[in-house]
């Protein structure tokens, strides 16, 4: 069944305020790979909330078994619950599938938070609200897990959309998207529009909410405003990019740009927060604190541990600064910036004790594995994973949450020299370690 109609978001307009809608730029249109224009059958095929991940409905096996699968651009295994678990309503039953093939191999995947293990096989897979194809894909049947499945999240598996280099147990295990492209005529590109709720969801609203869209094989122009700006994929493992400058309310953090990418910067839909390297996080928090100093918040808030609440509808968005990340552009010495609002980096959460209040968690946190541009960043933008051309595109999302004064933005070009120097070169070890955050 279709996932339901798109609802206007309570604390923001569906697009920029009237009069501010940017004209569609066409200079990049002719260069887009794949089908252009409308992917009606794929729009609104995601559900979920930033705190628990976004999932797409998939079917596995013959006859088809329907499962909800977390969309994760920060890992590369397609894995599904395959045994009873207290948090799972349903799971993949291999013995019921006539097309299941055992690969006779175990697999173990640790994330920053949570881990799982299981048995590898292949089966027929399709996406009901996706392209009209069925592919044979590698599947990890999860038999044991720890802090991986989330109570009430409504997903039963994970779709790792990154590259084979970080697949487990090794890079010989072909990821789902590679199989999809190889076995069909679908172009090697997908795009994500993650629509943050903008307000805490109670049970009734949660059922009606729509999470966003995963467009497989191209770009849907109805999902963004303005133009798409592209940053190169530095290396095909995670979706690694290079940040060349960071500003808080237009104030440069003035750090050596290598610090922003230490030890990497990735775009990861499976992580909730914007995660920053220790030094960068400390500088950013100092700057955000200073900008929002008209109100005092406990230290626990800045550590992501404590909620802050305001009477419903009175959240003082204007006291919080915007955060801008400048990304390496496609042209030498050219960058562009993406700007998010507090509506993205303050994550709405339900506080049972004060359900009449609007409560939020600070969704910027510290990382020891580099910058992770998680859902709080992605919820501001339509993000194009143009694998065919080794680049990631950003445009202002048509569903991002904002107010009448400010909107998320993607702007450029800016002149930035020596951007290559901003990338950190990880010392070569025998094996790279998958440490995707699930913060």
């Amino acid at each position: 069944t279709h996932l339901g109609i798109r609802l206007p978001l309570r604390s923001g307009l569906a697009g920029p305020p009237l009069g501010l809608r940017l004209p569609r730029e066409t200079d990049e249109e002719s260069e887009e790979p794949g089908r252009r224009g409308s992917f009606v059958e794929m729009v609104d095929n995601l559900r979920g909330k930033s705190g628990q991940g976004y999932y797409v409905e998939m079917t596995v096996g013959s006859p088809p078994q329907t499962l909800n699968i977390l969309v994760d651009t920060g890992s590369s295994n397609f894995a599904v619950g395959a045994a009873p678990h207290p948090f799972l309503h349903r799971y993949y039953q291999r013995q019921l599938s006539s097309t299941y093939r055992d690969l006779r191999k175990g697999v173990y995947v640790p994330y920053t938070q949570g881990k799982w293990e299981g048995e590898l096989g292949t089966d027929l897979v399709s996406i009901p609200h996706g392209p009209n194809v069925t592919v044979r894909a590698n599947i990890a049947a999860i038999t044991e897990s720890d802090k991986f499945f989330i109570n009430g999240s409504n997903w039963e598996g994970i779709l790792g959309l990154a590259y084979a280099e970080i697949a487990r147990p090794d890079d010989s295990l072909e990821p789902f998207f590679d199989s999809l492209v190889k076995q069909t005529h679908i172009p090697n590109i997908f795009s994500l529009q993650l629509c943050g709720a903008g307000f805490p969801l109670n049970q009734t609203e949660a059922l009606a909410s729509v999470g966003g869209s995963m467009i497989i094989g191209g770009i849907d122009h109805s999902l963004y405003t303005g133009r798409l700006w592209y940053t190169p994929i530095r290396r095909e493992w995670y979706y690694e990019v290079i940040i060349v400058r960071v500003e808080i309310n237009g104030q440069d953090l003035k750090m050596d740009c290598k610090e922003y990418n230490y030890d990497k910067s990735i775009v990861d839909s499976g992580t909730t927060n914007l995660r920053l390297p220790k030094k960068v996080f400390e500088a950013a928090v100092k700057s955000i604190k200073a900008a929002s100093s008209t109100e005092k918040f406990p230290d626990g808030f800045w550590l992501g541990e404590q909620l802050v609440c305001w009477q419903a509808g009175t959240t003082p968005w204007n006291i919080f600064p915007v955060i801008s990340l400048y990304l390496m552009g496609e042209v030498t010495n050219q960058s562009f910036r993406i700007t998010i609002l507090p509506q993205q980096y303050l994550r709405p959460v339900e506080d049972v004790a004060t359900s009449q209040d609007d409560c939020y968690k600070f969704a910027v946190s510290q990382s020891s594995t580099g910058t992770v541009m998680g859902a709080v960043i992605m919820e501001g933008f339509y993000v194009v994973f143009d694998r065919a051309r080794k680049r990631i595109g950003f445009a202002v999302s048509a569903c991002h949450v904002h107010d009448e004064f400010r909107t998320a933005a993607v702007e450029g070009p800016f002149v930035t020299a020596d951007m290559e120097d901003c990338g950190y070169n990880i010392p070569q070890t025998d094996e790279s370690t998958l440490m995707t955050g699930r913060a």
Partner: antibody, heavy 124, light 107 residues
Framework: EVQLLESGGGLVQPGGSLRLSCAAS????????MGWVRQAPGKGLEWVSA????????YYADSVKGRFTISRDNSKNTLYLQMNSLRAEDTAVYYC?????????????????WGQGTLVTVSS | EIVLTQSPATLSLSPGERATLSCRAS??????LAWYQQKPGQAPRLLIY???NRATGIPARFSGSGSGTDFTLTISSLEPEDFAVYYC?????????FGGGTKVEIK
């Protein structure tokens, strides 16, 4: 000190059944994978079965699949191997072994130490 | 099934000599390979795991190397207590398999 004590071995006729037990102490049993390995007299080693800490992941050798069942009782710190439809080629010393973590398939999670073993003889 | 072939079957050496034991897999096992030592009447004990990591309490004279299909266990200078049978084992694919063993005996 880690201790693994196997019991339940003995002489059984072909087609018969036997249940081996492995009593574990000196570590948190529920947080370790456990396994059974066998060694026929004068021969090499053969993996028989293994289970993750909570029993979710289970491995069986092809030669015993459908005949042997591994299980564990974490409240009793005991690992079991139920052996049915026994054959002459199942004759061996059966060792119980402790995994390096709760995970069965994790790199680094190898099995050590092993118990001293219990002899199973299948003969008419 | 992945077959692990150990060579030589028997290695006759004197204490103080260097022992080099080989384990070859019929297909890649990445680094999911370990080495065990077994003395007569005793249970095996883990020496090396994940191809090159020494297990807890194992002396530095034991070292492992290799990945993919070719693996080596080296004992840099044999001690009297090192004379035993050595097995390699893989956990990359089902079924998990052991090599046939290499017996290191006193010359």
């Amino acid at each position: 000190e880690v201790q693994l004590l196997e019991s339940g071995g003995g002489l059984v006729q072909p087609g018969g059944s036997l249940r081996l037990s492995c009593a574990a102490s000196g570590f948190t049993f529920s947080s370790r994978a456990m396994g059974w390995v066998r060694q026929a007299p004068g021969k090499g080693l053969e993996w028989v079965s293994a289970t993750s800490g909570s029993g979710g992941s289970i491995y069986y050798a092809d030669s015993v699949k459908g005949r042997f069942t591994i299980s564990r009782d974490n409240s009793k710190n005991t690992l079991y191997l139920q052996m049915n439809s026994l054959r002459a080629e199942d004759t061996a010393v059966y060792y119980c072994a402790k995994g390096g973590s709760q995970w069965l398939y994790a790199p680094g999670s190898w099995f050590d130490p092993w118990g001293q073993g219990t002899l199973v003889t299948v003969s008419s | 099934e992945i077959v692990l072939t150990q060579s030589p079957a028997t290695l006759s050496l004197s204490p103080g000599e260097r022992a080099t034991l080989s384990c070859r897999a019929s297909q890649s096992v990445s680094s999911y390979l370990a080495w065990y030592q077994q003395k007569p009447g005793q249970a095996p004990r883990l020496l090396i795991y994940d191809a090159s990591n020494r297990a807890t309490g194992i002396p530095a004279r034991f070292s492992g190397s290799g990945s993919g299909t070719d693996f080596t266990l080296t004992i840099s200078s044999l001690e009297p207590e090192d004379f035993a049978v050595y097995y390699c084992v893989q956990r990359s694919n089902f079924p998990w398999t052991f090599g046939g063993g290499t017996k290191v005996e006193i010359k």
